[in-house]
Interface confidence: medium
C-alpha cells in the first residue's frame, strides 16, 4: 500500500488523485501535437520540440527543466545522391531500380524533410554480385545455409526479411558470413496481417512501405565515438575506424513490392523448409544468383549515406522529493522519430507528458513525492539509444548511488489486445498490486480489473492465475540504467495477441505511415489503452517515489534465479559426457541460489517487522532494497561486452531485443560442440559458472543483517 504520512500532505493527494487527473483526451491532444511533422534526431524540428516540451513541463509545475546536449555520431542519406538497389544486366545497365521514397500518406503529400528509407550507419559503397536469400538472417539461418546446405555467402549480397531479431544482429551475422552487402525487406508474412487492409484503409503495411532503423552493434556503448564517457564539449573522439559497432558492409531496406522483383528471379537451391517461405508469390529460392534466363543479371547496391557528429538534446525535468530528495525515480522515453512517430515514440511521449501534467497539478496543490522524480525526453534513441546513454554516462556516479528505479516510456501501444510488461523481478509484486487496482479497458471485461483481463489474455507459463511478465532485453532506453548501472527497471505497453498475430512488431513500424491517424482510426480511437498505459507507468512511478518502504520484493528474485539456474543447467546437460570429462559442476550456483532464497526470506520477514518510524532503520532497509539490483553488476562486464554488466540478465548475443538469463554461461555454452578447442571452451563455461555463483552469493549477502 502507498503511504503518505511522511510527506505531510492532505489525504486527497494520494495515488487515486494522481490517477484521476490523467485524461485520455489530453493524451490524444498531445499525440496530435507531437506528430504533425517529422522529428528526426539531430534536426532543427526535434530541437524545437525539445524546447516546447521544456517550456510545457515548466508550465506543468516541475521544479526545474533543463536541456542536456551532446555531440554524437548520427547518420543521414545524401540528399542529392539517393540510395537505391538495381538489377543490372550483363552490360551493366540498370534494368530495375528500387523506389527512392515511400508514397506519402494522404494529407502529408506536402510535408518536407521526410527522410527516405535507409539503414542508419551503413557505410557507403556500390557492391554488385549474386543474391543469396538468408531468411531472417538469424544465427540459425546461417547455420542452415553454411552447415546443412553448404551455401557460401562470401562475396555475395544477401537479402534478409525483417522480423524475429534486431536488424543489427542480422547485419553482424551477414558480415561474419562474408557477405558484401545486405538488403533488408518486410515480407507480408511478418508485416501484413490477413484480413486487414493496407494503410490508409487499415493498419497493414502497403507494398511501398519500408522500415527504417539503425544497424549498429553497440552492445550498450552509446555514442560510437565516445564509449564509456559523455560526448561533451571536451570529449576525445575515436577515429571512425575505431568507432564502436559500425557495420562494415552496405545495407539498405526495401518494401515488399521491390523485394518481389528481386526474389522472383532467384534460382539456385530451393528453400530448405516451409519456415523459409514468406507470403510473396515467389519461390523463395536461396540462390546464389538468379535462375536460368536471368543468370547473367546481378544486383547492385548504391549507398551514399554519411556519418556526421551532430548535436542532440535531452529534456530533463525534476520534481524534488520532500523526504528523500537524494533518491531518484526516473520516467524516461524518447522524443526523436524516424518520420512522424505516430506510435514510436510519440504514443509514449504523449503519455509521459500527461503524467508530468498530473504530477504537476498535485505539486501546485501543495503535494510533493517522498523521493525525487526525474522525467526525461531522450533524443537519438533511434540511432542507438544515444541520448539516454550519454546522459547516464555523464551522471553515472549520481545514478549508481541514488537511482531507485527507471521506468521506460517508449511506444504506449503495439496493439490493443492486452498489457505487456517486462521488468526486474523486484517489480513483479508492484505490477501485480497496481494492476489489481486499475480498471481493464478491454471489451468484455467491463467492471473487471486490469490484472484480470491481462491474466486471462496473457497467462504466466509457470504460475496459474498470474500474468506473464517478461525479462528485460534491450533496444530501448532502459538499457544503460539496467544492463550497465544495475538500476531496477521496467516497461509497460499495450500489445497484440501474439497467438493469432505472428507478424513482427506492428506492420507500419518505422515507416512513413506511422501517423496520428493510424492510432486515432485503427488502434485506439478512444485513447483508452493509452490511458491505461499512463495509469500503469504513472502508477509505478508514484508508488516507487512515494511509498515509505520501497515496493520491491526480493523473494521474487529468488524464485527466478532458481528457474534460470535450472534452465542453464539443463542446457549444459545436453553434453553429459563433456561435463564429466571436464568436471563441470553447477553445485556452486545452486548453492548460491539456495543461500539467496533463505536470506531473501529472512530479509522479507524483517521488512514486515521493523520500526518504520525510525528514519535511520527505514533508510537502511530501503538502501538494501535499492542496492540489490546493483549487486548483480560485475564491474568487468560480460566477455567482449564491457557495457553489459548485469550477471543475471543481458540482451541476447543473437537478438538485442530479447533478454537472456545467466548470459555469461549461456554464451559460453552456445554452439560449444563446434568449438575447435573443447577444453578451452568448457574451461570458459566453468569460469562463467564461478562468476555467476559468486555474484548471486555476493548479492545475497547484501540482504543479510548488516551487523
Amino acid at each position: 500500500k502507498s503511504s503518505n504520512e511522511a510527506t505531510n500532505i492532505t489525504p486527497k493527494h494520494n495515488m487515486k488523485a494522481f490517477l484521476d487527473e490523467l485524461k485520455a483526451e489530453n493524451i490524444k491532444k498531445f499525440l496530435y501535437n507531437f506528430t504533425q511533422i517529422p522529428h528526426l534526431a539531430g534536426t532543427e524540428q526535434n530541437f524545437q520540440l525539445a524546447k516546447q516540451i521544456q517550456s510545457q513541463w515548466k508550465e506543468f509545475g516541475l521544479d526545474s527543466v533543463e536541456l542536456a546536449h551532446y555531440d554524437v555520431l548520427l547518420s543521414y542519406p545524401n540528399k542529392t545522391h539517393p540510395n537505391y538497389i538495381s538489377i543490372i544486366n550483363e552490360d551493366g545497365n540498370e534494368i530495375f531500380n528500387t523506389s527512392l521514397f515511400e508514397p506519402p500518406p494522404p494529407g502529408y503529400e506536402n510535408v518536407s524533410d521526410i527522410v527516405p528509407p535507409f539503414s542508419a550507419f551503413s557505410p557507403q559503397g556500390m557492391p554488385e554480385g549474386d543474391l543469396v536469400y538468408v531468411n531472417y538472417a538469424r544465427t540459425e539461418d546461417f547455420f542452415k545455409l553454411e552447415r546443412d546446405m553448404k551455401i557460401n555467402c562470401s562475396g555475395k549480397i544477401v537479402i534478409a526479411r525483417y522480423g524475429k531479431v534486431f536488424r543489427g544482429n542480422k547485419v553482424k551475422n551477414a558480415q561474419l558470413a562474408g557477405a558484401k552487402g545486405v538488403i533488408l525487406y518486410s515480407d507480408p508474412a511478418d508485416y501484413f496481417a490477413p484480413g486487414v487492409k493496407s494503410y490508409p484503409d487499415g493498419w497493414n503495411l502497403p507494398g511501398g512501405g519500408v522500415q527504417r532503423g539503425n544497424i549498429l552493434n553497440l552492445n550498450g556503448a552509446g555514442d560510437p565515438l565516445t564509449p564509456g564517457y559523455p560526448a561533451n564539449e571536451y570529449a576525445y573522439r575515436r577515429g571512425i575506424a575505431e568507432a564502436v559497432g559500425l557495420p562494415s558492409i552496405p545495407v539498405h531496406p526495401i518494401g515488399y513490392y521491390d523485394a518481389q522483383k528481386l526474389l522472383e528471379k532467384m534460382g539456385g537451391s530451393a528453400p530448405p523448409d516451409s519456415s523459409w517461405r514468406g507470403s510473396l508469390k515467389v519461390p523463395y529460392n536461396v540462390g546464389p544468383g538468379f535462375t536460368g534466363n536471368f543468370s547473367t543479371q546481378k544486383v547492385k547496391m548504391h549507398i551514399h549515406s554519411t556519418n556526421e557528429v551532430t548535436r542532440i538534446y535531452n529534456v530533463i525535468g525534476t520534481l524534488r522529493g520532500a523526504v528523500e530528495p537524494d533518491r531518484y525515480v526516473i520516467l524516461g522515453g524518447h522524443r526523436d522519430s524516424w518520420v512522424f512517430g505516430g506510435i514510436d515514440p510519440q504514443s509514449g511521449a504523449a503519455v509521459v507528458h500527461e503524467i508530468v501534467r498530473s504530477f504537476g497539478t498535485l505539486k501546485k496543490e501543495g503535494w510533493r513525492p517522498r523521493r525525487t522524480i526525474l522525467f526525461a525526453s531522450w533524443d537519438a534513441e533511434e540511432f542507438g539509444l544515444l541520448g539516454s546513454t550519454e546522459w547516464a554516462e555523464e551522471n553515472s556516479r549520481l545514478l549508481q548511488e541514488r537511482g531507485v528505479a527507471y521506468i521506460n516510456a517508449d511506444s504506449s501501444i503495439e496493439g490493443n489486445y492486452t498489457l505487456r510488461v517486462d521488468c526486474t523481478p523486484l517489480m513483479y509484486s508492484l505490477v501485480h498490486n497496481l494492476t489489481k487496482e486499475l480498471k481493464s479497458p478491454d471489451e468484455g471485461f467491463e467492471g473487471k480489473s486490469l490484472y484480470e483481463s491481462w491474466t486471462k489474455k496473457s497467462p504466466s507459463p509457470e504460475f496459474s492465475g498470474m500474468p506473464r511478465i517478461s525479462k528485460l532485453g534491450s533496444g530501448n532506453d532502459f538499457e544503460v540504467f539496467f544492463q550497465r548501472l544495475g538500476i531496477a527497471s521496467g516497461r509497460a505497453r499495450y500489445t497484440k495477441n501474439w497467438e493469432t498475430n505472428k507478424f513482427s512488431g506492428y506492420p507500419l513500424y518505422h515507416s512513413v505511415y506511422e501517423t496520428y491517424e493510424l492510432v486515432e482510426k485503427f488502434y485506439d480511437p478512444m485513447f483508452k489503452y493509452h490511458l491505461t498505459v499512463a495509469q500503469v507507468r504513472g502508477g509505478m512511478v508514484f508508488e516507487l517515489a512515494n511509498s515509505i518502504v520501497l515496493p520491491f520484493d526480493c523473494r521474487d528474485y529468488a524464485v527466478v534465479l532458481r528457474k534460470y539456474a535450472d534452465k542453464i543447467y539443463s542446457i549444459s546437460m545436453k553434453h553429459p559426457q563433456e561435463m564429466k570429462t571436464y568436471s563441470v559442476s553447477f553445485d556452486s550456483l545452486f548453492s548460491a541460489v539456495k543461500n539467496f532464497t533463505e536470506i531473501a526470506s529472512k530479509f522479507s520477514e524483517r521488512l514486515q517487522d521493523f520500526d518504520k518510524s525510525n528514519p535511520i532503520v527505514l533508510r537502511m532497509m530501503n538502501d538494501q532494497l535499492m542496492f540489490l539490483e546493483r549487486a548483480f553488476i560485475d564491474p568487468l562486464g560480460l566477455p567482449d561486452r564491457p557495457f553489459y554488466r548485469h550477471v543475471i540478465y543481458a540482451p541476447s548475443s543473437h537478438n538485442k531485443y530479447a533478454g537472456e538469463s545467466f548470459p555469461g554461461i549461456y554464451d559460453a555454452l552456445f554452439d560449444i560442440e563446434s568449438k575447435v578447442d573443447p577444453s578451452k571452451a568448457w574451461g570458459e563455461v566453468k569460469r562463467q559458472i564461478y562468476v555467476a555463483a559468486f555474484t548471486v552469493q555476493a548479492a545475497a549477502e547484501t540482504l543479510s543483517e548488516v551487523a
Epitope: 530495375f96 523506389s99 508514397p103 493496407s198 494503410y199 507494398g207 511501398g208 507470403s279 508469390k281
Partner: nanobody
C-alpha cells in the same frame, strides 16, 4: 467495396489506336500494382501489362511491346492502356486487375471492355 470499371473499348481497324481506361474505387489505388489482362474469344487469359504503384516500372508481354503503353494517374485513381498499331490478334476482352503479390490475398477484376480489331 473494391470496384474496377473499364471503358474505351470498341471496334477499330487494323493499325488503329484505342485508349482503355480503368476507374478504381474502394481501395487506396496508389498502394497497388495494377494489371491489364485480356481474353481472346475461345482462349485463356493472357497477361498484357502491369505497372508498379508509383508508375516508375512497367512490364509488357512480348507481343505488345512497342505498341502498348500502360500508365496511371494516382490523383484520379485511374489506370490506362494506350494501344497503337492494333492487330486482329489483339481482339479480346480487356480486364483491369488489382492483383495481390501476397499469398492468400484475393485479387480483383473489372467486368472487362471488348476490343475488336477488324477491317
Amino acid at each position: 467495396e473494391v470496384q474496377l470499371v473499364e471503358s474505351g473499348g470498341g471496334l477499330v481497324q487494323p493499325g488503329g489506336s484505342l485508349r482503355l481506361s480503368c476507374a478504381a474505387s474502394g481501395f487506396t489505388f496508389s498502394s497497388y500494382w495494377m494489371y491489364w489482362v485480356r481474353q481472346a474469344p475461345g482462349k485463356g487469359l493472357e497477361w498484357v501489362a502491369n505497372i508498379n504503384h508509383i508508375g516508375s516500372e512497367k512490364y509488357y508481354v512480348d507481343s505488345v511491346k512497342g505498341r502498348f503503353t500502360i500508365s496511371r494517374d494516382n490523383a484520379k485513381n485511374s489506370l490506362y492502356l494506350q494501344m497503337n498499331s492494333l492487330r486482329a490478334e489483339d481482339t479480346a476482352v480487356y480486364y483491369c486487375a488489382r492483383d495481390s503479390l501476397i499469398v492468400g490475398e484475393r485479387g480483383y477484376w473489372g467486368q472487362g471492355t471488348l476490343v475488336t480489331v477488324s477491317s
